[in-house]
C-alpha cells in the first residue's frame, strides 16, 4: 500500500478541514480494508486516535475528537479521508493516516502537518 | 514521561463516601480525557466513566449514575472520584487512565476496602 | 450495555506455542482492544483498534476480527506473556471489558 497526503494543511480557527489521505494498493479494496487516524500534538504528548474505518466508518467514543470528526473517503476510489469539524489551536499538530489492505503489505503511515491559523478580522486588514 | 499517582489505600464503613485522588504529570493535562476503571478482588475490569479535563464535563456509567462523581483541578493537575454510599460490593482496586490510542497509561490503583 | 465473552477463560501453553485468544460480543461491535495484566498490576495496552499494537508492543501479538468476533494471537509465546488478557470494546457506551483470559504456563 501506498500513502499520498497533503503533507501541510493550514486551516482557520473554527472552521472545518478536510484530512486528505488517498493510496494506492495492488489488491482489490474488499472487507479486509481498514483506516485507522491518529494525531500527535505538538507538545510531544502522547498521540490520540483520532478515526477508524473497517466496513463501516467509527468515530472515537472518547477524547478531544468525540463528535468532531467524520469519514469523507471512498475505498472504492482510494480515498481515505476525513474531515475535522470546529478547529481549535490545540488541534495544531501531525495527523498520520495508517491504510492496510491485506494481503498487501502495509506501507509508510501519510503524514499531515495542520496548522491553525488566527481567524483574520476585518479590522486587521490594512488598506494601503 | 506520563504518570499518574493516586492515592492511598482507604477503609471505609458502608454507607460512607470514598474521594480518590490522581495526579497526573509529564503531559498537557486538560488534552486527554480521565477515566475511573475499578477491578474487584479476582474480578474483570468495570469503566466507571470519565472526565474531559477542559470543561469539566463528564461521562458515568449508568449503573453508578447518582453514586460517582468525578471532577477535576486544573491548577494541580489531579482527577478526583468520589462514590458514596458504598456497600461491601465496591471492594475494589480503583484505577484512573487516560484515553490516547486506547487507555494507554494508568495509576497504580487504589485499594478501597469496604467493610463493617 | 454490550457483553463480551472471552474464550477460552483459562489457557495452558508452552513457551514457543502459538496461541489464540477469542472475544464474542453480544451484539456487532465496530473495533476492539486487548489489555495485558499481571497480578498487582494495572493492565498494559497491547492492540488498539483491533488490529494496531500499541506502543513498544513486539510484533509476536495481533489482533484481528470484526463484527461480533475478535481474535488476539500471540505467534510464539514467551515467558513474559503468561498473564490475564482483557478484551475492551468502545463502539458503544458504556465500554466493556471479557471476563479475562488467563494464560498459565503448561
Known amino acids: 500500500v501506498e500513502i499520498y497526503t497533503s503533507r501541510v494543511l493550514e486551516a482557520v480557527n473554527g472552521t472545518d478541514a478536510r484530512l486528505k489521505c488517498t493510496f494506492s494498493s495492488f489488491a482489490p479494496v474488499g472487507d479486509a480494508l481498514t483506516v485507522t487516524w491518529n494525531f500527535r500534538p505538538l507538545d510531544g504528548g502522547p498521540e490520540q486516535f483520532v478515526f477508524y474505518y473497517h466496513i463501516d466508518p467509527f468515530q472515537p467514543m472518547s477524547g478531544r475528537f468525540k463528535d468532531r470528526v467524520s469519514w469523507d473517503g471512498n475505498p472504492e476510489r482510494y480515498d481515505a479521508s476525513i474531515l475535522l469539524w470546529k478547529l481549535q489551536f490545540d488541534d495544531n499538530g501531525t495527523y498520520t493516516c495508517q491504510v492496510k489492505n491485506p494481503p498487501d503489505v502495509d506501507g509508510v503511515i501519510g503524514e499531515i502537518r495542520l496548522s491553525v491559523v488566527h481567524t483574520v478580522r476585518f479590522s486587521e486588514i490594512h488598506f494601503l | 514521561q506520563v504518570q499518574l499517582v493516586q492515592s492511598g489505600a482507604e477503609v471505609k464503613k458502608p454507607g460512607a463516601s470514598v474521594k480518590v485522588s490522581c495526579k497526573a504529570s509529564g503531559y498537557t493535562f486538560t488534552n486527554y480525557w480521565m477515566h475511573w476503571v475499578r477491578q474487584a478482588p479476582g474480578q474483570g475490569l468495570e469503566w466507571m466513566g470519565e472526565?474531559?479535563?477542559?470543561?469539566?464535563?463528564?461521562d458515568y456509567n449508568e449503573k453508578f449514575q447518582g453514586r460517582v462523581t468525578m471532577t477535576v483541578d486544573k491548577s494541580t493537575s489531579t482527577a478526583y472520584m468520589e462514590l458514596s454510599s458504598l456497600r461491601s460490593e465496591d471492594t475494589a482496586v480503583y484505577y484512573c487512565?487516560?484515553?490516547?490510542?486506547?487507555?494507554?497509561?494508568w495509576g497504580q490503583g487504589t485499594l478501597v476496602t469496604v467493610s463493617s | 450495555d454490550i457483553q463480551l465473552t472471552q474464550s477460552p477463560s483459562f489457557l495452558s501453553a508452552s513457551v514457543g506455542d502459538r496461541v489464540t485468544i477469542t472475544c464474542r460480543a453480544s451484539?456487532?461491535?465496530?473495533?476492539m482492544y486487548w489489555y495485558q495484566q499481571k497480578p498487582g498490576k494495572a493492565p498494559k495496552p497491547l492492540i488498539y483498534v483491533t488490529s494496531n499494537l500499541a506502543s513498544g508492543v513486539p510484533s509476536r501479538f495481533s489482533g484481528s476480527g470484526s463484527g461480533t468476533e475478535y481474535t488476539l494471537t500471540i505467534s510464539s509465546l514467551q515467558p513474559e506473556d503468561f498473564a490475564t488478557y482483557y478484551c475492551?470494546?468502545?463502539?458503544?457506551?458504556?465500554?466493556?471489558f471479557g471476563q479475562g483470559t488467563k494464560l498459565e504456563i503448561k
Open positions: 487512565t487516560i484515553y490516547t490510542t486506547a487507555l494507554d497509561y
Open positions: 475492551q470494546q468502545w463502539s458503544s457506551n458504556p465500554p466493556t
Open positions: 451484539s456487532s461491535v465496530g473495533y
Open positions: 472526565i474531559n479535563p477542559t470543561n469539566g464535563g463528564t
